[in-house]
């Protein structure tokens, strides 16, 4: 399969895709939605000691194929050239979500023993800074 | 992560060759002029959030705990995306017409995974 | 094999204008940049500018930005380059040349035309 | 933009002598896009030595090129009859591209 679509010229473009990811998405739709989560409702209290809870953000919307005249390029941030042939190709649907590698940490202390004792860990890749069709 | 190979349709990635010459981009990205970028398709059923390699993060999985609980945010929508980008070295044209030669960072869909 | 045909000659009145024609062969015409050097009588090279069959993308050197316009017809695999107000500065041989890719990231002027000589007389 | 100067601008060699011209930049340029090209009189110029170092197809190995930043060299380690023509050096790494005034080399 190739991609139906051609896309206008742009000698910038590789500055743009490094520059850091714009809220909203350029999919009005994809965005970035707060929840406060406790690790109770999780059943992770037991292991999770501290935070008791946390403002968790996940990515909702949709990424509907209409591509503004003006937009030249994908979502800057995104991959660059995959990420708008993606929704060119069967079968390939751009999905609206957190930005592969900019997802960040939470610490928290936890506990395997009860709470007699604790240790410091770090929860990989738990908050979204940044939504995109992708 | 897993592979297409045309006997599944959960999450995997989808060997594509990305042609430069046919998206219109060959006047600007001077070489290489076509590579293989890849792309991620397939179901995204809630059970895979368990499995090892295919849920894309632990964030993945505070999402699924939440669904199988059928607790909000019930309409967030599983789907398959890029969980691992590799960098390619490429030559292009700057906007002056300078010319760059720069690893590019997100440029090539290693894995896949349901997020 | 690659070929590129450009007529041997022109004589232009000052003032006026002429539009160069180079006509590639032997390769897909869409996929490389095409440039134009300009040489005086017993001088050397000028780079004049370039353009992408593609997209009719173009690069001017600044000094002839004003003097040479650059079009393509892609139906028939041909440049053109347009130059006006005619001065005897612009009496030169004007060479239309493909810009190739030699691999390992490398290119290069690699395939040239034969040149048109172009004579700016009353 | 980047001037090339070439010297010298005319030379003389002996058949079988060890030739060297320079091409020097007011600015630096990344060897990966500096290029000779070979001229012979009333024809167009030939693609000769490309990325600085690498003989264009059909280049006799007894030229070599070399440099880097703002310094750059053709050679010819033995002078031969058809070697006396002129020689341009050529940067495509910052816009105008630009030519050297050229070398003419001569028989001795």
């Known amino acids: 399969s190739t991609p139906l679509m051609s896309w206008p010229w742009s000698p910038s473009a590789l500055r743009l895709l490094q520059r850091p990811p714009e809220e909203p998405a350029a999919h009005a739709n994809c965005h970035r939605v707060a929840l406060n989560i406790s690790f109770q409702e999780l059943g992770w209290e037991r292991w999770i000691v501290y935070p008791p809870s946390f403002i968790f953000h996940y990515c909702h919307g949709g990424c509907g194929l209409h591509i503004p005249p003006n937009l030249s390029l994908p979502v800057p941030g995104a991959p660059p050239t995959p990420a708008q042939p993606y929704s060119l190709l069967p079968g390939a649907q751009p999905c609206c979500a957190a930005l592969p590698g900019t997802m960040r940490p939470l610490h928290v202390r936890t506990t395997s023993d009860g709470g007699y004792s604790f240790k410091y860990e770090t929860v990989p890749n738990l908050l979204t800074q940044h939504c995109a069709c992708i | 992560g897993l592979e297409c190979d045309g006997r599944t349709n959960l999450c995997c990635r989808q060997q594509f060759f990305i042609d430069f010459r046919l998206i219109g981009w060959n006047d600007w990205i001077i070489a290489p002029t076509g590579y293989y970028g890849n792309y991620c398709e397939g179901s995204c059923p809630a059970y895979l959030a368990g499995v090892p390699g295919s849920a894309s993060s632990f964030h993945t999985a505070v999402v699924n705990q939440y669904r199988m609980r059928g607790l909000n945010p019930g309409t967030v929508n599983s789907c398959c995306i890029p969980t691992k980008l590799s960098t390619m070295s490429m030559l292009y044209f700057d906007d002056e017409y300078n010319i760059v030669k720069r690893d590019v960072p997100n440029m090539i869909v290693e894995e896949c995974g349901c997020a | 094999q690659v070929q590129l045909q450009q007529p041997g000659a022109e004589l232009v009145k000052p003032g006026a204008s002429v539009k160069l024609s180079c006509k590639a062969s032997?390769?897909?015409?869409?996929?490389?940049?095409m440039y134009w050097v300009k040489q005086r009588p017993g001088q050397g090279l000028e780079w004049i500018g370039m353009?992408?069959?593609?997209?009719?993308?173009?690069n001017y050197n600044g000094k002839f930005k004003t003097g040479a316009t650059l079009t393509v017809d892609k139906s028939s695999s041909t440049v053109y380059m347009q130059l006006s107000s005619l001065t005897s500065e612009d009496s030169a041989v004007y060479y239309c040349a493909r810009w190739g890719y030699g691999g390992n990231y490398d290119y290069a002027m690699d395939y040239w035309g034969q040149g048109t000589s172009v004579t700016v007389s009353s | 933009q980047i001037v090339l100067t070439q010297s010298p601008a005319i030379m003389s060699a002996s058949l079988g002598e060890r030739v060297t011209m320079t091409c020097t930049a007011s600015s630096s340029v990344s060897s990966s896009y500096f290029h000779w090209y070979q001229q012979k009189p009333g024809s167009s110029p030939k693609l000769w030595i490309y990325s600085t170092s690498n003989l264009a197809s059909g280049v006799p190995a007894r030229f070599s090129g070399s440099g880097s930043g703002t310094s750059y060299s053709l050679t010819i380690s033995t002078m031969e009859a058809e070697d006396a023509v002129t020689y341009y050096c050529?940067?495509?790494?910052?816009?105008?591209?630009?030519f050297g005034g050229g070398t003419k080399l001569e028989i001795k």
């Open positions: 032997g390769y897909t015409f869409t996929n490389y940049w």
């Open positions: 050529h940067q495509y790494h910052r816009s105008p591209w630009t």
């Open positions: 353009i992408h069959p593609n997209s009719g993308s173009t």
